[in-house]
Interface confidence: low
């Protein structure tokens, strides 16, 4: 016990210290001595709960001794100095280092003073996100994969998407013992509307200052979706040319466009130019259904459009509207 009327010495240390797997960490531990108080420290001792013996000792004449000399080091304690700082550095942090440690000062006249510190071992995960290229399966499949590798504790993965779908998240042991690899798949029914859109994987971990966002651009392979534009139902006999356009969306891109009519090949006044069909002026009314057939690596699809070229109304000059 200290002499009556004097302030006691206090061992100061955080209740919990975080450290990263494989890195070094300092367990801070200081002896606070009130201004008028006198104390003499003869030993600093570190031990771990549940283990016999001490893991590190600093003796005022013998200096330091460690159970694992390559992994432990007193940060500030030196022979010939006042032993007020017992802070201990641990190198190459392992999962099994997590636990409760006791820092103890052997002092005179106050006796021994100690404090407990909980060492928490963290591992900062590596995060990757990748697209899972798919076709139109008609059933839910993974379209994106987000992997948070080697986190301790496990990372928390969520998805942000305007496309619908649902996550499928699983955990497996990480490469380093005690770490966890979290794999999250974003699963939906693929459609052409999904192709080229993005989903965002959000990874949260206590080692991050802020959540990590990884955007994945989705790829859905689908056959062409075809429509024909350029006709407004108001084409009249005239000298002007008009154009129909075959609008196709597909992934991969279209490899070919083929124009025909329901009657077979194109009439002389219609000239195919890739995705466009040039309609030359005609001198008599026509009523023709044009077909545009579009091909890509996954197949062929077509669209039809019936075009009427009429005689101009009596009240106004006749003319094919130019598009």
């Amino acid at each position: 016990w200290p002499p009556p009327g004097t302030g006691d010495i206090i061992v100061q240390a955080p209740t919990q210290v975080p450290g990263f797997l494989g890195d070094s960490v300092t367990l801070p531990c200081y002896l606070q001595v009130p201004g008028m108080e006198e104390t003499h420290v003869s030993q600093l001792t570190w031990s771990r709960h549940g283990e016999s013996g001490s893991m590190a000792v600093f003796h005022q004449t013998q200096g330091p001794n460690y159970s694992e000399p390559k992994r432990l080091e007193f940060v500030a304690a030196r022979l010939g100095t006042e032993l007020r700082d017992a802070s201990l550095r641990m190198f190459g942090l392992r999962v099994e280092d997590e636990g409760n440690y006791t820092c103890l000062f052997v002092t005179f006249p106050q006796g021994s003073r100690s404090v407990d510190i909980w060492l928490r071992v963290l591992a900062k995960p590596q995060n990757t996100a990748e697209v899972q290229k798919v076709q139109l399966t008609g059933k839910p499949v993974p379209v994106a994969r987000c992997v948070s590798t080697g986190g301790r504790p496990p990372a928390h993965i969520t998805w942000h998407s305007d496309l619908g779908g649902m996550p499928n998240t699983s955990q497996a042991p990480g490469f380093l013992s005690g770490t966890v690899t979290v794999t999250s798949l974003w699963i939906l029914v693929p459609s052409s509307q999904v192709d080229g859109k993005s989903v965002t994987c959000k990874v949260e971990h206590e080692s991050f200052e802020k959540p990590q966002l990884l955007t994945v651009n989705l790829t859905v392979y689908y056959p062409p979706e075809v429509s024909i534009s350029g006709y407004d139902n108001n084409w009249y006999l005239s000298q002007n040319e008009a154009t129909l356009t075959c609008d196709a969306r597909s992934n991969p891109e279209p490899t070919g466009y083929n124009w025909s009519t329901t009657m077979g090949p194109l009439p002389p006044f219609a000239v195919a130019q890739g995705a466009q069909l040039l309609i030359r002026p005609v001198d008599k009314p026509i009523n023709t259904t044009f077909i545009c057939n579009v091909t890509n690596a996954l197949g062929a699809r077509q669209a039809e459009l019936t075009v009427q070229v009429k005689e101009g109304p009596p009240s106004e000059p006749s003319g094919m509207s130019s598009n």
Epitope: L21, G22, V147, S170, P173
Partner: antibody, heavy 116, light 107 residues
Framework: EVQLVQSGSELKKPGASVKVSCKTS????????MHWVRQPHGKGLEWIGG????????SYNQRFKGRVTITVDKSTSTAYMELSSLRSEDTAVYYC?????????WGQGTLVTVSS | DIQMTQSPSAMSASVGDRVTITCKAS??????VAWYQQKPGQPPKALIY???YRYSGVPDRFSGSGSGTDFTLTISSLQAEDLAEYFC?????????FGQGTKLEIK
């Protein structure tokens, strides 16, 4: 394109050591764990061990502990597997394989023959 | 160590057949199972991860299922190029272990 290119075939005498290399390209070497797996002719696959290139932390199959050493050279993005005290039953094709939870990329394999 | 027991060890099937290979783990491995295809003279190629998800580029005739201790690889309609040996692997705990393989021959 991810590539794992291994060193050529080796013929060793019993008791000797062998060191097989695996040069990687097409990805960031320090972001993935590299493992070694072997396959005796006509038989199954056996995991030997692995290494995290960033920290050099290793994990070995206890069956090989004491005989195997896995190392990396970050400057050349190359992994190495050294097996000592070779015996005839170590004759096998040795593969390096990148780990992503499963082994997604493999080297072409290195045949190690142990014979007197 | 977790044992992965594959069956059958060898089988013969005709083009177009539905083929099923099973793998039984000696203890619960969740869904931490992968399947590999190894063609003669080549390294293994990953087909399935997390027990049931195909790698990009793997034909959809290949499918995986199962969790816990019982796992299945199915080829819905066998093709000539599927001639290979197939392996399962658990990555639930060290040491990682593989099944002994199933050699698939085409009739």
């Amino acid at each position: 394109e991810v590539q794992l290119v291994q060193s050529g075939s080796e013929l060793k005498k019993p008791g000797a050591s062998v060191k097989v290399s695996c040069k990687t390209s097409g990805y960031t070497f320090t972001e993935y764990t590299m493992h070694w797996v072997r396959q005796p002719h006509g038989k199954g696959l056996e995991w030997i061990g692995g290494i995290h290139p960033n920290q050099g932390e290793t994990s070995y199959n206890q069956r090989f502990k004491g005989r195997v050493t896995i190392t990396v050279d970050k400057s050349t993005s190359t992994a190495y597997m050294e097996l000592s005290s070779l015996r005839s039953e170590d004759t096998a094709v040795y593969y390096c394989a990148r780990w992503t939870g499963d082994f997604d990329y493999w080297g072409q394999g290195t045949l190690v023959t142990v014979s007197s | 160590d977790i044992q992965m027991t594959q069956s059958p060890s060898a089988m013969s099937a005709s083009v177009g057949d539905r083929v099923t290979i099973t793998c039984k783990a000696s203890q619960n491995v969740g869904t931490n199972v992968a399947w590999y295809q190894q063609k003669p003279g080549q390294p293994p190629k990953a087909l399935i991860y997390s027990a049931s998800y195909r790698y990009s580029g793997v034909p959809d005739r290949f499918s995986g299922s199962g969790s816990g201790t019982d796992f299945t690889l199915t080829i819905s309609s066998l093709q000539a190029e599927d001639l290979a040996e197939y392996f399962c692997q658990q990555y639930e705990s060290y040491p990682y272990t593989f099944g002994q393989g199933t050699k698939l021959e085409i009739k």
